[in-house]
């Protein structure tokens, strides 16, 4: 049987059940190569409390549909009077990056995971030439996830003192220049994730090969190498390589630019101080507030919730958007869709789409940007579920009793962007990270 998601085959992936201190290793096309789980384990469970290993999915006993992958075992469950077997179930949803498998829950018999990934999309519009896993768990099983830094088009400019060259990078993925035909970036060779531009020439100095690595709790490393055998004439016979070290800052701060810290014989070392290198619980919340010792900040957007069936309305030219954030109040137009953001076509108000649901909510504060994300909305033709990204700005003189109002700024591939100036986005900082 052919592998259902070949892009995911090259790596062994990890997921964590934080509540029970369990680390899962997943290889969807082969085996995870952990002796304690046996030679054919596709999903290996490591219980760190009991220091035991169990195979909870066998690569030989795999069944697949377009959106679901199941690995059975021959091990009976502990449920009395049943002949169920232990199994793992991975539900796949379309995402804009390779993404990460997320542990959902485990019953006596079944270990459930969800994975938003380009590999599950109906169309190839989000697929990269080359992309590698962009997250890692540290020794405390805390997740560090650089997926939000991945640019689907364009690149980051590396701060370099050399006026004659420009070094562009993407994170975990090659640089896509198709959306900007006029810039210097257009000359970059396909597949490159690190592109050096000198005058009118552009050179591939690195492509992603291995996934993100953790070197210390707050330092992550990504390595790019030039795959082609042909040497560049300005590299003195060496093969180009790029090492990007992502550093979690010691306290809250605005984002910084990736900086070139060393350069020798086409070996480029880059340091990027960014809060995205910190563990995810430091940056994100599933509620509308971020506070406490762990986050170093106090943010509470819950006063923005609307009661009594009213919603914020944002005009998007062809569409009206109805928003009801930080609550579970149904939007009238989007009845029964559990939408936090509802898109209604002006010319035909029967055309209604959920652009993100209130139980699929993430509040993120990273590198000085405060963002509320609603995902899991109605599907677009690509298979991607509509989502909304609301970028908040602190404004102590905002109207509407300080609440302000969301403004639609545009749509990119079924992701809807809004900005919202409000006094409730004014962040209070603590200092003890």
């Amino acid at each position: 049987q052919a592998a259902p998601f070949p892009e995911l085959c090259s790596y062994t992936w990890e997921a964590v059940d934080t509540k029970n201190n369990v680390l899962y290793k997943i290889n969807i096309c082969g085996s995870v190569d952990i002796v304690q789980c046996g030679p054919s384990s596709a999903v290996c469970m490591h219980d760190l409390k009991t220091r035991t290993y169990h195979s909870v999915g066998d690569s030989v006993l795999r069944s697949a549909t377009r959106s679901l992958l199941e690995f059975n075992t021959t091990v009976s469950c502990d449920q009395q009077g049943t002949n169920h077997r232990v199994q793992s179930s991975i539900a796949f949803l379309c995402g804009k990056t390779l993404g990460t498998p997320e542990f959902v829950t485990a019953t006596f018999c079944v270990h459930y995971f969800e994975w938003r990934t380009t590999a599950a999309c109906k169309k190839d519009i989000f697929k990269a030439n080359k992309e590698v896993p962009c997250y890692v768990f540290d020794e405390e099983l805390r997740k560090h996830d650089l997926n939000p830094l991945i640019k689907l088009s364009g690149a980051y400019l590396v701060d370099d003192s050399d006026p004659d060259t420009s070094l562009f990078i993407n994170v975990c993925r090659d640089i896509d220049t198709l959306r900007d035909p006029g810039s210097q970036l257009r000359a970059c060779p396909p597949g490159t994730a690190a592109c050096l531009v000198r005058g009118h020439q552009a050179f591939d100095v690195g492509q992603p090969r291995d996934g993100l690595k953790v070197v210390r709790k707050d330092r992550l490393v990504l390595s790019y190498v030039r795959e082609e055998a042909g040497k560049l004439d300005f590299c003195d016979g060496h093969s180009p390589a790029v090492t990007i070290t992502f550093v979690c800052p010691s306290e809250r701060r605005e984002g910084t630019i990736p900086k070139l810290t060393a350069k020798s014989n086409c070996r480029y070392e880059i340091e990027w101080i960014t809060e995205y290198a910190c563990h995810r619980d430091y940056l994100e919340s599933k509620t509308c507030s971020l506070s406490g010792e762990q986050q170093d900040v106090s943010i509470d957007l819950t006063p923005l919730a609307q009661s009594g069936g009213s919603s914020y309305i944002s005009d998007g030219k062809e569409y009206l958007f109805y928003l009801n954030v930080c609550g579970e109040t149904e939007i009238q137009f989007c009845n029964k869709k559990q939408a936090a953001v509802c898109q209604v076509k002006k010319s035909d108000t029967s055309q209604v789409k959920a652009a993100g649901r209130y139980h699929n909510q993430t509040l993120r504060y990273s590198d000085g940007d405060l963002t509320l994300i609603y995902f899991g909305g109605d599907e677009c033709s690509s298979g991607f579920q509509r989502m909304s990204v609301i970028n908040f700005e602190c404004n102590k003189t905002a109207g509407n009793d300080g609440k302000g109002t969301p403004v639609f700024t545009g749509e990119v591939d079924c992701t809807y962007f809004f900005t919202w100036d409000t006094e409730y986005a004014c962040v209070h900082h603590h200092h003890h990270h």
Partner: nanobody, 123 residues
């Protein structure tokens, strides 16, 4: 690709003010960063100010810091350059530009450009 159209240029006395506008049409991707550049006769095009579309992070050339302010109105797909305390050396054609490169002020990294609007500051 995005199309850009500047307006608001003109003749002004030293110490005066002008507000330039740049309207974006086509697909105004949120991945774009937006910049103002200027080019005086016989000189190279130089960076003036930049802003992220998805947030209000800004950067300025040292020569205009404290005098110029870049802003955006997302509802109108428009960016602005408010120019105060104008000096004769601010005389130039001002261009609006869009880039898919983060953290750049280099004009060659901007792929979409407007036609420009003339600003003349007399002494």
């Amino acid at each position: 690709q995005v199309q850009l159209q500047e307006s608001g240029g003109g003749l002004v006395q030293a110490g005066g003010s002008l507000r330039l506008s740049c309207e974006a049409s086509g697909r105004t991707f949120n991945t774009y960063n937006w910049g103002w550049f200027r080019q005086a006769p016989g000189k190279e095009r130089e960076f003036v100010a930049a802003i992220r579309w998805s947030s209000s992070k800004t950067s300025y050339a040292d020569s205009v810091k404290g005098r110029f302010t870049i802003s955006r109105d997302n509802a109108k797909n428009t960016i602005y350059l408010q120019m105060n305390s104008l000096k004769p050396e601010d005389t130039a054609v001002y261009y609006c530009a869009a880039s898919i490169v983060d953290f750049t002020t280099n004009p060659s990294h901007f792929g979409s450009w407007g036609q420009g609007t003339q600003v003349t500051v007399s002494s």
